[in-house]
């Protein structure tokens, strides 16, 4: 008996060909002998089963002796045992319909659970196999379960249903909801305008829900609603916004936040968090901002960095084109009685530079110049 | 002691421009906002607007926000209002302030007479 | 906007009595437990003097007689006890949304 494996909803041909290469008559019942359909000449005719509408032919092939029974929109309980009878003999096909659905939405959020389900017909004991797009396999019998969903596997999983050593492959577009980078550091000099930036890694039709920006400055004992917010359909829409600082907000997707200058009290880490109509969870992204100021009092040149700065950051004082004069692990540097000319606070990590300030001292007459 | 020094008296004609000063002491100037605050002879009190001086950013109220530049010169810690296309009824005391700790304008300069007339 | 409106517009008070002033505000100025309203005092050819922050709290050298209460839209100053020199016209100020906005005032006379 041959086997064929078909999908659910799609469509399947189950062939029959007679030693003839003419149009003879011929039928396809199931396996309760109720008639699918035949022809009386060159019409088609169709019997009372359950798959009346579904069930074809093509006439086309039927002078070649060929008469293939197509099965559309399959259901899992299509399937069955289809016999073709023509020129006196009968042919058996056993059809097998497979589905596989993932057990929600496709569009999940990062760090959900992935589940997908297979459907087989009474008796199989199909063996399955997907494929992540980012290359990870994951093997299961009815159902499959990845859990902490990443955002490499945003794409189509392939996954293969093994029965009777025949295949069939499914394809299921997954989309992981989530940010572009889960967390991001912006570096900027006392007095300048700070952007924060939130693009998504994906895109949908029609995007709806709401988001808030706590904040949390090095300064304070607690966390603060910046901002709160309303997305509908790609546009925003702020609810709501502190006075100080008042941070003004994009319009249109990507989500951008601009914070009108950066101030040492403004230093601190925030969490951007996005929850999404007819979703559970939310979307999660960290900002941190690091905040430099250069101040000359008297006869002390002071740098100094607020802000969640790691401990290998190198905070350096030095004279324009001249060896630092100060370079520690610190938040803070300072120069006694330094000379005159244009000075610099870097903050670097392994060599490369983060962020710099520059700062004039005059001759000791004079008061400092910050350019 | 933080202080808000204003700019002393102005009379306009109507359409002229006026640019009040206020000049702050006592605390770092870019690390508050600057906001300016209209009353008019005998009435209540109106917000104009805000500046951020560190970066100069400014939010102005969208009844002025067409005759009206907010400004911040930190190198002479100065905050400026400018207003343009002057009519009677910006005849009034213009204020500028600072906040607190809290939410309320703590300090407040002593006001600059505006009167516009022809 | 956020329309403030307060009441009475005037009010005369004996030294050593309560003085009550109210504030309704066009819609809730309350967020994440706080109530954004502050209250000021200001007298003939003087800038407004900041009393009360955040609804209820104190400004730093404002005298304990004066006191702020209320959340979501309705709030209250109260001065108690009543003394001459609180001759003055009171503000309410919603520091919630911009525009920032202040109710048009309440002038307080001793008797």
């Known amino acids: 008996k041959k086997v064929v494996l078909g999908k659910k909803g799609d469509t399947v041909e189950l062939t029959c060909t007679a030693s003839q290469k003419k149009s003879i008559q011929f039928h396809w019942k199931n396996s309760n002998q109720i008639k699918i359909l035949g022809n009386q000449g060159s019409f088609l005719t169709k019997g009372p089963s359950k798959l009346n509408d579904r069930a074809d032919s093509r006439r086309s092939l039927w002078d070649q002796g060929n008469f293939p029974l197509i099965i559309k929109n399959l259901k899992i309980e299509d399937s069955d045992t289809y016999i073709c009878e023509v020129e006196d003999q009968k042919e058996e096909v056993q059809l097998l319909v497979f589905g596989l659905t993932a057990n929600s939405d496709t569009h999940l959020l990062q760090g959900q659970s992935l589940t997908l389900t297979l459907e087989s017909p009474p008796g199989s004991s199909p063996s399955v196999q997907c494929r992540s797009p980012r290359g990870k396999n994951i093997q299961g019998g009815k159902t499959l379960s990845v859990s902490q969903l990443e955002l490499q596997d945003s794409g189509t999983w392939t996954c293969t249903v093994l029965q009777n050593q025949k295949k069939v492959e499914f394809k299921i577009d997954i989309v992981v909801l989530a940010f572009q980078k889960a967390s991001s550091i912006v570096y900027k000099k006392e007095g300048e305008q700070v952007e924060f930036s939130f693009p998504l890694a994906f895109t949908v039709e029609k995007l709806t829900g709401s988001g808030e920006l706590w904040w949390q400055a090095e300064r304070a004992s607690s966390s603060k609603s910046w901002i709160t917010f309303d997305l509908k359909n790609k546009e925003v829409s702020v609810k709501r916004v502190t006075q100080d600082p008042k941070l003004q907000m994009g319009k249109k997707l990507p989500l951008h936040l601009t914070l009108p200058q950066a101030l040492p009290q403004y230093a601190g880490s925030g969490n951007l968090t996005l929850a999404l109509e007819a979703k559970t969870g939310k979307l999660h992204q960290e900002v941190n901002l690091v905040v430099m100021r250069a101040t000359q009092l008297q006869k002390n040149l002071t740098c100094e960095v607020w802000g969640p700065t790691s401990p290998k950051l190198m905070l350096s004082l030095k004279l324009e084109n001249k060896e630092a004069k100060v370079s520690k692990r610190e938040k803070a540097v300072w120069v006694l009685n330094p000379e005159a000319g244009m000075w610099q606070c870097l903050l670097s990590d392994s060599g490369q530079v983060l962020l710099e300030s520059n700062i004039k001292v005059l001759p000791t007459w004079s008061t400092p110049v910050q350019p | 002691q933080v202080q808000l020094v204003q700019s002393g008296a102005e009379v306009k004609k109507p359409g002229a421009s006026v640019k009040v000063s206020c000049k702050a002491s006592?605390?770092?100037?870019?690390?508050?906002?600057i906001h300016w605050v209209k009353q008019a002879t005998g009435q209540g009190l109106e917000w104009i607007g805000e500046?951020?001086?560190?970066?100069?950013?400014?939010y102005s109220n969208a009844k002025f926000k067409d005759r009206v530049t907010i400004t911040a010169d930190k190198s002479t810690n100065t905050a400026y209002m400018e207003l343009r296309s002057l009519r009677s009824d910006d005849t009034a005391v213009y204020f500028c302030a600072r906040r607190g700790n809290g939410t309320g304008f703590a300090y407040w300069g002593q006001g600059t007479l505006v009167t516009v007339s022809s | 906007d956020i329309v403030l409106t307060q009441s009475p517009a005037s009010l005369a008070v004996s030294p050593g009595q309560r003085a009550t002033i109210t504030c309704k505000a066009g819609q809730s100025v309350d967020y994440d437990g706080d109530s954004y309203m502050n209250w000021y005092q200001q007298k003939p050819g003087q800038p407004p003097k900041l009393l009360i922050y955040?609804?209820?709290n104190l400004e730093s050298g404002i005298p304990s007689r004066f006191s702020g209460s209320g959340s979501g839209t309705d709030f209250t100053l109260t001065i108690n006890p009543v003394e001459e020199n609180d001759t003055a016209t009171y503000y309410c100020q919603q520091s919630y949304k911009d525009p920032l906005t202040f109710g048009q005032g309440t002038k307080v006379e001793i008797k």
């Open positions: 500046i951020y001086p560190g970066s100069g950013s400014a």
């Open positions: 006592g605390y770092t100037f870019t690390d508050y906002v």
């Open positions: 955040v609804a209820s």
